[in-house]
């Protein structure tokens, strides 16, 4: 092809060439043609002869103001076409009259601003239609009954005032899964235009200036459709009351978006008449007081989202919004309540009473005064099935015994990015039976006793990360009742001491966080007492993490029980020798990270069975002695291995001797090394 | 399931040593801290200490920290306790036991070895 | 360390009559404390940990409870085999303090 197109698989890309013509030299039995964002005028039917096989055709972001009606002549297969982000203006009866086997067609952003006629009348296949960002001032796409098979009506983005009967009944056969009408001026709605669609599922009128007024008429002219889904975001809907939605009564809707509405004022059993809702979002509001009614009704409703829904009006403690005792429990089905991001002054002894299906709360930054948890905190929550508490980003300081002692179904905890500063004595956790869970990283420091777990033997995954970490050093060992942990994250904590009994029993562990800590004294021989073999019993270990330790030496043995090792990190530490053999036991090593040492000889000896299996290696940045004995069987290794070693031309550099000083180590020349022979497999 | 075995009485005289034994079994020794418990007739429990028979490192009561040394060796699955310069006070059941799952607890006790301090 | 007291030292009571043993701890134990059971010439048994958690095969008529560094043990129904010696102990760090014990006989 003298184009510049690629094609695989039957499937040509020719964007983004600047073509001002269709190529002619493709091969013949592409079924997928690209020609998006290039500068083609037209699209002349003789050239698609040779493309008969296509099925999609892509022409966005061009400067086509016209289409030959033959086009789709040459194209009997085609059923998905696009024309997005072009010039057409007029659409007459003759332009898509060979295209029969459409499913999509997209035409959105052009400059289409009347349909006259029937253009589509012969789309019986068409399943979505967009024609959004264009300039139409109504919703009359035809004169006659048509488009029966379509299910998604894209309008959004254009000047369409009134949703009128006698445009909307060209789709007296179709059901409509979406109609999509946002970002229009809708004032009206006359009576009976969405009864003259066969069925409508979805609606969507999202940025549509409504308000209460218009809300409560649009759901009068619903009553009695098949609308399931419907959506009114951004439509400046500042309240609710018993009537607004009055008109759904009639209906099954199951889906209700009122998401950056600034709603203000949710008045009381606003939504009894929605018992079949089952998916509610109502995130990014403005409501200053939740009633005990105001959710009334809602006996469905599985997915609540409340983020952002109440926010302070000023600085002043008597504008923080409040959510009245019992407001929740109508919501009998509710599986899953996000309520981030809110300014709620704190939990009240009934606030989350009634919820008995609750699975997943999130809590993150939802409250301005949330200090401590005490066993009374969540004693609402106690007849809810909770499995996942996210209590993020509280400014939480302090944990109470029984704190979490009506969660007993609670799997997952997470407390990170508060402020907790306390000792843990493990009554912290009393009740959490079932609990795989507890992410305490990012808080303010926790000094742990040998009890600080002991209640919760179940917990498979700890993560505390940052936490100034005190007694870790405590023997027994603060870990020793966790023997479920597969994971443990310890890192960043400027640790120091650890006995060698630390993670005894923990043989189920995968995946052991150390990075940024100060462990290094423990590997030296000179240690009193010798190397701190801390990492003994790990028999299931996949990943090990030691970066930013410090660590000058390794002890041969260190890895040795590590026999399901899959990636090690040692990056930036001042590693410069590796005894012989520290990764002879290191059979299932994928990922080998040593980047940022002091590292001048890569042997054979040492590295040789690190390497047998390595998917990963990183070993940029290290002084490399760029002599035989040091490195010539590395660099015959790398030239020959498949094993990705990113940046390899550019950070993996020869620091000595003096004349190869920045030299790529990859170039170094070996054919005058005696005994440089890669290792054989 | 796990047992604790222990030899059911001693007889020693004053100012000498004795060493009792505490044989476990049913699970894997050296994932389970021993600890060591002292009962005079007709009288209370007393904890002694209690040792990682992992790694032999030991936490004793300071009560007991000259009169007991405790020891394992790992090859037999058997913990021991010295006790030395045996006077009537030493006179009493030894019993060896072990936390269970949940670590704030004895569910599993040696049935106990009765030493007499007599001459 | 922490101290132990428990009281009272002896009980006289009655098959079918209901019975309370306290210990109290001189420092806060934080809910780590076990409840035994023992017979003439044998082993303790564990009865109740963690204050208040029943150990596996304890009949339902024991029960634990704790306010403050105060923590019972109640017995309802006495039953023939119920008599013997009754010992608490702390769990909060060492050494693991137990009680003098409770004698409680049959009437």
């Known amino acids: 092809s003298t184009t510049k197109c690629t094609v695989s698989h039957e499937v040509a890309d020719c964007s983004h060439l600047k073509l001002t013509q269709v190529p002619d030299d493709l091969p013949t039995n592409i079924t997928v043609l690209n020609l998006t964002h290039n500068q083609l005028r037209r699209l002349p039917a003789a050239n698609f002869t040779r493309y008969s096989q296509l099925t999609s055709l892509d022409v966005g972001f061009n400067t086509i103001s016209k289409l030959e009606p033959e086009l789709c002549q040459k194209l009997p297969m085609l059923k998905v076409l696009n024309l997005q982000h072009n010039e057409l203006s007029q659409l007459s009866d003759k332009t898509f009259a060979f295209c029969t086997n459409l499913t999509e067609l997209h035409l959105m952003s052009n400059s289409i601003q009347k349909i006259k006629n029937n253009p589509f009348v012969k789309q019986k296949n068409l399943i979505t239609l967009d024609l959004s960002h264009n300039g139409l001032s109504s919703t009359k796409l035809g004169t006659q009954v048509q488009l029966e098979n379509l299910q998604e009506l894209l309008l959004s983005n254009n000047k369409i005032q009134a949703l009128k009967s006698e445009e909307l009944d060209i789709f007296a056969n179709s059901s409509l899964k979406k109609l999509e009408l946002s970002s229009n001026q809708i004032k009206e709605f006359s009576p009976g235009c969405f009864h003259a669609i066969g069925r409508l599922f979805g609606l969507f009128l999202n940025n549509v200036q409504l308000g209460p007024s218009l809300t409560e008429k649009l759901c009068l002219e619903l009553a009695n459709t098949s609308i399931r889904n419907l959506s009114l975001s951004n439509s400046q809907l500042s309240t609710t009351s018993n009537t607004t939605f009055l008109g759904l009564k009639w209906t099954n809707l199951t889906m209700l978006d009122l998401s950056y509405n600034n709603l203000n004022v949710v008045g009381n059993d606003s939504f009894a008449w929605l018992p079949q809702l089952e998916y509610f979002f109502l995130e990014y509001n403005n409501i200053q007081h939740l009633f005990s009614h105001s959710l009334h009704g809602l006996f469905n409703v599985r997915y609540l989202n409340l983020k952002r829904s109440f926010t302070k009006q000023s600085i002043s403690l008597a504008s923080l919004p409040k959510i009245d005792d019992f407001s929740f429990q109508w919501l009998k089905c509710l599986e899953h309540l996000n309520m981030e991001d809110n300014d709620i002054p704190g939990i009240k002894s009934n606030m989350f009473t009634g919820l008995i299906n609750l699975k997943y709360l999130s809590l993150s930054n939802s409250f301005t005064s949330l200090r401590t948890l005490t066993n009374e905190t969540f004693v609402s929550l106690a007849h809810s099935p909770l499995h996942i508490l996210n209590l993020t980003k509280n400014k939480i300081s302090k944990i109470e015994s029984d704190a979490f002692s009506w969660l007993g179904h609670l799997e997952v905890l997470d407390l990170g990015l508060n402020e907790i500063g306390q000792e843990l004595t493990g009554q912290e956790w009393r009740g959490l039976e079932n609990i795989f869970e507890i992410y305490l990283s990012y808080n303010k420091y926790l000094q742990l006793t040998r009890n600080s777990f002991a209640l919760v033997p179940s917990l498979q995954r700890l993560m505390l990360r940052r936490v100034a970490l005190k007694n870790v050093d405590s023997s027994p060992s603060p870990f020793q009742p966790l023997r479920n942990l597969t994971i443990l994250d310890l890192s960043n904590n400027n640790i120091a001491n650890i006995n060698d009994d630390m993670l005894e029993g923990l043989e189920k562990l995968e995946i052991l966080d150390l990075q940024h800590n100060n462990l290094a004294r423990l590997w030296k021989h000179a240690n009193p007492g010798g190397p701190i073999y801390f990492l003994k019993g790990l028999s299931h270990l996949h990943i090990l993490n030691l970066e930013s330790n410090g660590f000058d030496e390794i002890p041969v043995e260190v890895f040795k029980d590590l026999f399901e090792l899959k990636i090690i990190d040692l990056g930036l530490n001042n590693l410069n020798t590796l005894p012989a053999s520290v990764f002879n036991n290191q059979v299932s090593l994928k990922s080998l990270n040593l980047q940022k040492n002091l590292i001048t000889s890569v042997e054979k000896k040492v590295f040789g069975p690190a390497f047998r299996n390595l998917t990963e290696l990183d070993m940029r940045f290290n002084p490399f002695d760029c002599t035989c004995e040091s490195i010539a069987w590395f660099v015959n290794w790398i030239n020959e291995t498949h094993t990705n070693i990113p940046e390899l031309s550019s950070h993996y550099l020869c620091n000595t001797p003096p004349h190869y000083h920045g030299f790529p180590v990859r170039l170094f020349d070996t054919s005058s090394c005696k005994d440089s022979a890669p290792f054989e497999l | 399931q796990v047992q604790l075995q222990q030899p059911g009485a001693e007889l020693v005289q004053p100012g000498t040593s004795v060493r009792l034994s505490c044989k476990a079994s049913?699970?894997?020794?050296?994932?389970?801290?021993i600890h060591w418990v002292k009962q005079r007739p007709g009288q209370g429990l007393e904890w002694i200490g209690e040792i990682n028979p992992n790694n032999g490192r030991i936490n004793y009561n300071e009560k007991f920290k000259t009169k007991a040394t405790l020891t394992v060796d790992k090859s037999s699955s058997t913990a021991y306790m010295q006790l030395s310069s045996l006077t009537s006070e030493d006179s009493a059941v030894y019993y060896c036991?072990?936390?269970?799952?949940?670590?704030?607890?004895?569910?599993?006790w040696g049935q106990g070895t009765l030493v007499t301090v007599s001459a | 360390d922490i101290q132990m007291t428990q009281s009272p030292a002896s009980l006289s009571a009655s098959v079918g009559e209901t019975v309370t043993i306290t210990c109290r701890a001189s420092?806060?134990?934080?809910?780590?404390l076990a409840w035994y059971q023992q017979k003439q010439g044998k082993s303790p048994q564990l009865l109740v940990y963690?204050?208040?958690t029943l150990a596996d095969g304890v009949p339902s008529r024991f029960s634990g409870s704790e306010s403050g560094t105060q923590y019972s043990l109640k017995i309802n129904s006495l039953q023939p085999e119920d008599f013997g010696s009754y010992y608490c102990?702390?769990?909060?760090?060492?050494?693991?303090?137990f009680g003098s014990g409770t004698k409680l006989e049959l009437k």
């Open positions: 049913g699970y894997i020794f050296t994932t389970y801290w």
């Open positions: 102990q702390h769990f909060w760090s060492t050494p693991f303090t």
């Open positions: 420092g806060n134990i934080h809910n780590y």
């Open positions: 963690n204050a208040k």
């Open positions: 036991t072990r936390v269970g799952v949940m670590i704030t607890t004895f569910p599993y």
